[in-house]
């Protein structure tokens, strides 16, 4: 595929980490400066859903 070049390092204003509006299954990744697919967040101490942060849940599946 013809990849567009993202000149991340030439756009280093502190605004770069401000989330843009993403759809419900996505979130803003400051690393790639775009909306990406996101899994539900979890709280590490209890592994239970947090009432403090909306859209949180249990830990992700174990890695390789």
């Amino acid at each position: 595929m013809g990849a567009r070049r993202l000149r991340v390092r030439s756009q280093r204003s502190r605004d770069s980490s401000v989330p843009t509006q993403c759809n419900q299954t996505e979130c803003f990744d400051p690393l790639v400066r775009n909306c990406v697919s996101c899994e539900l967040f979890h709280t590490p101490d209890t592994g239970h859903t947090s009432s403090l942060e909306p859209g949180t849940a249990l830990q992700p599946q174990e890695g390789s």
Epitope: L6, D29, P30, N34, V36, S37, G63
Partner: antibody, heavy 125, light 107 residues
Amino acid sequence: EVQLVESGGGLVQPGGSLRLSCAASGFTISSSSIHWVRQAPGKGLEWVAWVLPSVGFTDYADSVKGRFTISADTSKNTAYLQMNSLRAEDTAVYYCARRVCYNRLGVCAGGMDYWGQGTLVTVSS
Amino acid sequence: DIQMTQSPSSLSASVGDRVTITCRASEDISTAVAWYQQKPGKAPKLLIYAASFLYSGVPSRFSGSGSGTDFTLTISSLQPEDFATYYCQQSQISPPTFGQGTKVEIK
């Protein structure tokens, strides 16, 4: 089960080219950023490049910029690293990895959760 | 590019010891830090993300803390399988950069 499998490594002479492949299964690469990370013998991890297949965004380490090209074919669920003008200092094990994101108040909180087994690239005459 | 300075580069410890590894970023990266464990001949494994969140399946003896520029990985009670090399990585601004690694060896 999520899996990443690299291929395409081997022995190449300085100035030569290689194309590495990273075949993904268990998830669709269009939804994540895919990264190449390398490790020279006895050395630490060095990030090489990433691609966001959904939009074609890319970025590169300064050490490979202009020589390496990262791309992805979403229909094959595979990412690639085209390596040209190879140098002895490019000798390393090359890993591909998926960056996972968890939604923390609309912002990604994440890391590279799945890695391939690595493929060795040796640049030598 | 953001530099990640990891210390120490190596350490010797015994089973049961508490081990602390630090990583300092050259600029503020909020909590966008991950920690990885790597054993010889193997791919790295994700331990901690977002500075303090334990990845699934990782033993609770591993913990992370910090924000801004200073970050810490702690192993509360070192186990035989923990002897490995550990890396921090920032993902706040591209290019994502790794620390140089900390090798944890048997004393």
